[in-house]
Amino acid sequence: MAVTACQGLGFVVSLIGIAGIIAATCMDQWSTQDLYNNPVTAVFNYQGLWRSCVRESSGFTECRGYFTLLGLPAMLQAVRALMIVGIVLGAIGLLVSIFALKCIRIGSMEDSAKANMTLTSGIMFIVSGLCAIAGVSVFANMLVTNFWMSTANMYTGMGGMVQTVQTRYTFGAALFVGWVAGGLTLIGGVMMCIACRGLAPEETNYKAVSYHASGHSVAYKPGGFKASTGFGSNTKNKKIYDGGARTEDEVQSYPSKHDYV
């Protein structure tokens, strides 16, 4: 029951996380124009991975895509790639995990197959979450670098001419959505991996039994030695027959010429 709950919760958490990664990737507010000390108030600019938007003082908003590929920074391309890889891995992970769910029966699929699928989807979710977190962090680092470079230019300028007052950008909402979503996907993946351990069928445990023959007249009763699966009636390692057989716990330590191990 706990395994099913862990697996189900892991799936739901990952699903929310991947939905968040998709939302963050599509959002336009990855960076927003820093308004502090900016003399230009007629326009407010915010930018995403795919397009830039301007909201004018009149209330009119217009967005334009970055139609050039070569003119864009390599870091932006890297962030795009990381987010897309995260989405693709997450989507495949979701597909695999649906079939791996313990509460869903598909033909005669064995528990070992479900365990492997759960582990696979868990690893995919972990990598997906890491991709999203990495992508968002790289973008955030790019913004911080750009911000301080712009601030430096603001106060030094080139030849006494201040160059970039209006080019400072700060963290947009998409960064926080991406961080949280990546974290959720990662947590969901870890939960799936934990659930996998519980799903794997238990190995048959043959309990060691020592036989103590008390006399030559002891008759061996076939079928007395049973494999314990943890589900049978002999879960406490009780005596199965009386013919001198003892469990390890019950064996006596006094020496005898008839002792056989």
Partner: nanobody, 118 residues
């Protein structure tokens, strides 16, 4: 690369008028503003006026009611009509194009001198 060519500066008497123009050549990202900034000797750069690609206009506090900015999007040109000029308007006037492509870009003209004096 975007190139800006300014013209129209010169010497004018107080109360007089002057018209500055700035033509931008090259590929400019669709979301942008074109405008004018000025810098007097020993002073910080100051916003004069800007005109956005969407039609919004903003003036600096010191020139409101006296200066008029206009923009011809087809020609990628911005004009600044200056009237009722005062001696304190004396400065180097710089044309600026700011594009809102990824993390923004600034392009500046070489500047044109405007002197208001008797």
């Amino acid at each position: 690369e975007v190139q800006l060519v300014e013209s129209g500066g010169g010497l004018v008497q107080p109360g007089g008028s002057l018209r500055l123009s700035c033509a931008a050549s090259g590929s400019i990202f669709g979301l942008n503003f074109m405008g004018w900034w000025r810098q007097a000797p020993g002073s910080q750069r100051e916003l004069v006026a800007i005109a956005t690609s969407g039609g919004s206009i903003q003036y600096g506090d010191s020139v409101k009611g006296r200066f008029t900015i206009s923009r011809d999007n087809a020609k990628n040109t911005v004009y600044l009509q200056m009237a009722s000029l005062k001696p304190e308007d004396t400065a180097v006037y710089y044309c600026n194009v700011h594009t809102y492509d990824f993390l923004g870009r600034d392009y500046w003209g070489q500047g044109t001198q405007v002197t208001v004096s008797l």
